[in-house]
């Protein structure tokens, strides 16, 4: 993996002497062996007839807040520790003047990693011990002497997991771009087996390689609005904890069984990836459970098959792609990989060939978006707590973080006289700096409207005279009639609306007869059902990408990949006059409310969706019996 003469494994390479651009302050120019790796750094590399300027920034989100390392101590006991002082030397960035460029490098001992310009992926690594200014090899991945690797996830297994092959015809999105959505986070736990440890020789070398790999994987996923955060590393420096077989399917099974046993005492993570030094049978370098992300089977096994860590990073990105519901590109009709060269493949190609892929295809992106629509994917939505991100809070970034009272942006841009922009504390005499109920640094009087009613299932909110923020959004009491249904937690759910959400504008509720039976695994109709609160049955529209369906006559139901579960009619959907679906049955509206809720509000408020009094302007919760001004006067306190 890391032989003493690295260039012996390259066909063609160019020798370059990187030049570090001087930073604005002396501290940035300190040598990296002092342990002060700067926040940002830039290098000029003369390669392939160009001068490339790489602008790099430390990957502050590489390690999760509670990052741990587990290994075996000299006395044979297992040790888990949280390393202190998480300064590191792993960077990401771009190449100046190239809009779609990317770079992911470590600067720990010279420069090692990749930078991408257009469709060209350049790999860089040191040729000697000369550090960042010493001789480096820059080469293209296809000039790395290695055998092609394939993914062990077979088309047969994908077929049963992703539904019938016809369901995988790819329809490009209008505008050909990813839908806008929040960033998703994979909290990753990496296990390194004993064969890999022996190959690399020390815990420090393993740690360095794993951080390099995860840094690269994170960079590849950033284009999909994903971040990959390492929350734990386990190094089997003494012996393997389960049998690592040359058969990748056996190894994956063993990994998942072992993980299930360990979950209670190890990190809560979204995904586990094994990196092994064992040579898998044939050309297989990776194997994964499809669409298993966020479940107990969320994991994959990866052979460290290439001298350059970008190799196993591409494998891990590919196997994680399977965990996220992606199929192999070649299995999908009309799938587009926007690589320039015919040989260029995208990350979800079944075989990596001789060059490392650097992007996801259009169909991989579509599979991913489809996976994210499932409730199962909820584990990816939790961003690591801002206050725990390595690097901590930043005063001047418009976000009020730990220890701050306000944040109005950088000092030269701040126009908020209520906030001291250099300290992010309230200005002298200010009660507040942000919020709808904050005006000229003072909290607005009670009873001022701060959030108007937006539809028939909403309620308006008023300032309470004490807080600068508008009170939490509240909705009409569940069961209040709305267009075609009954309000439920601020929505007005109907069968038609649900079918449109899944099947697009042409989707509509199927005939009533479709709801009259339940479906068993394997698409079999079963016992008679007396209501419309079982499986969601639709007709028309376009089948959602990446979802298997069960068709009986004109009734279309969506299933999970393995066909064992079906999309249910959601809670709160109208199933008849004065009736709603509740706990899987069509029940009377009374299930929503206690009959005397609004009576508790003393005629100065109404009951909301939480069965609490929502008071009219100027009246005080919890029962709207007193005016807010009376309550404040009695407590004698203002904000």
């Amino acid at each position: 993996i890391a032989p003493s003469r690295p260039w012996a494994l390259m066909e063609q390479y160019e020798v370059v002497l990187p030049w570090r651009l001087p930073g604005p302050r002396v501290r940035r120019a300190l040598p990296s062996h002092l342990g002060l790796h700067p926040e940002r750094v830039s290098y000029v590399l003369g390669a392939t007839g160009h001068n490339f300027t790489l602008h790099l920034r430390k990957n502050r989100d590489l390690l999760g807040s509670g990052y741990t390392e587990t290994y075996t101590a000299a006395n044979g006991s297992e040790v888990t520790e949280q390393p202190r002082g998480q300064d590191h030397c792993f960077y990401q960035g771009h190449v100046e003047g190239y809009p779609d460029s990317a770079a992911s490098l470590s600067t720990c001992a010279g420069l090692r990693g990749f930078f991408q310009v257009g469709s060209d992926l350049h790999l860089i690594e040191p040729l000697d011990e000369g550090g960042e200014g010493g001789r480096h090899a820059v080469y293209q991945a296809e000039h790395l002497l290695q055998t092609a690797g394939t993914c062990g996830v077979s088309d047969d297994s994908l077929g049963s997991l992703l539904g019938p092959r016809t369901a995988a015809v790819f329809r490009p999105r209008p505008g050909d771009s990813l839908p806008s959505r929040e960033t998703r986070y994979v909290e990753l736990y990496v296990v390194v087996d004993n064969a890999e440890f022996q190959m690399l020789g020390s815990e420090a070398a393993v740690r360095h390689r794993v951080l390099e790999v995860v840094n690269h994987v994170d960079k590849l996923y950033q284009k999909l609005n994903f971040r990959v955060v390492l929350v734990g590393l386990e190094i089997w420096n003494s012996q393997d904890r389960f049998h690592v077989s040359p058969d990748p399917s056996v190894t994956l099974e063993n990994l998942l069984t072992w993980q299930a046993r360990q979950r209670t005492r190890r990190h809560l993570h979204d995904n586990v990836q094994l990196i092994t030094g064992v040579d898998f049978t044939g050309t297989t370098v990776g194997f994964a459970r499809v669409s298993a992300m966020c479940s107990h089977s969320s994991g994959a096994v990866n052979q460290d098959h290439s001298k350059n860590p970008v190799g196993v990073a591409c494998t891990m990105a590919h196997e994680m792609g399977h965990n996220l519901g992606m199929d192999h590109d070649e299995n999908v009709q009309g799938c587009r990989c926007q690589e320039r060269f015919e040989a260029g493949r995208c990350i979800m190609a079944g075989s990596i060939g001789s060059s490392f892929p650097r992007m996801f295809s259009d169909c991989s992106q579509a599979y991913l978006e489809s996976f994210l629509e499932r409730p199962q994917s909820v584990c990816l939505a939790n961003a690591p707590d801002l206050s725990h991100l390595v690097g901590g809070p930043v005063c001047g970034n418009l976000f009020v973080e730990r220890g701050e009272q306000c944040d109005c942006g950088p000092p030269e841009d701040c126009r908020n006289r209520c906030c001291n922009s250099t300290t992010c504390q309230l200005a002298e005499g200010a009660q507040c700096a942000h919020g709808t109920c904050c005006q000229e640094c003072k909290v607005k009087p009670a009873g001022e409207l701060c959030r108007p009613k937006k539809d028939m299932c909403d309620l308006e909110e008023f300032c309470d005279g004490r807080h600068p923020e508008c009170p939490e959004d509240a909705f009409q009491e569940n069961g209040t009639p709305c267009s075609g249904g009954y309000c439920y937690n601020g929505a007005c759910p109907t069968l038609a609306q649900q079918c449109q959400a899944f099947w697009g504008p042409g989707g509509q509720a199927a005939e009533e007869s479709c709801f009259s039976y339940d479906i068993l695994p394997g698409c079999k109709a079963s016992r008679y059902r007396a209501d419309m609160c079982g499986v969601l049955q639709c007709k028309g529209g376009q089948q959602p990408l990446g979802r298997a369906i069960c068709i009986v006559d004109v009734c279309h139901a969506l299933t999970t990949e393995d066909g064992t579960a079906y999309e249910p009619v959601p809670e709160g959907t109208r199933c008849g006059p004065e009736k709603v679906c509740w706990k899987g049955r069509c029940q009377d509206l009374h299930v929503y409310r206690s009959s005397n809720c609004s009576a508790q509000c003393h005629n100065h408020g109404v009951c909301n969706h939480k069965q609490e009094c929502h008071c009219h302007a100027g009246w005080a919760p919890p029962h709207c019996a007193k005016l807010l001004t009376e309550v404040h006067a009695a407590s004698g306190s203002l904000p």
């Epitope: 926040e39 940002r40 602008h55 960035g93 961003a383 801002l386 930043v394 970034n397 000092p411």
Partner: nanobody, 120 residues
């Protein structure tokens, strides 16, 4: 120097939608936060929405539930989807990128602005 270019502004009727885009010359992943601000004639510039590097978002109360800020790291672009537009949303909308610098205060980079006019 970082360049930010806004687009997508225009004239729209009340209740309509617009989507503003802000393309950056560098990688948006290198900014700690990206934001949209607006300035109506005779008024101070105000923050509309911001998105942190972690994906967390921040909205002015007046636009909550109507506007959505998002970003596409692959395209180095930040978006502001504006639905249910009201005449009071009429303003010049500015894109803002916040760069964090070790040992110094953060620095804001600004675009030239794009005009949004909502007619009643």
């Amino acid at each position: 120097e970082v360049q930010l270019v806004e687009s997508g502004g225009g004239l729209v009727q009340a209740g309509g939608s617009l989507r503003l885009s802000c393309a950056t010359s560098g990688s948006i992943a290198s900014f700690n936060a990206m934001a949209w601000h607006r300035q109506a004639p005779g008024n101070q510039r105000e923050l509309v929405a911001a998105i942190h590097i972690s994906g967390n978002t921040n909205y002015a109360d007046s636009v909550k539930g109507r506007f959505t800020i998002s970003r596409d790291n692959g395209k180095n672009t930040v978006y502001l989807q504006m639905n249910s537009l009201r005449p009071e949303d009429t303003a010049v909308y500015y894109c803002n990128a916040i760069e964090v610098r070790t040992g110094l205060s953060p620095r804001g980079h600004w675009g030239q602005g794009t005009q949004v006019t909502v007619s009643s």
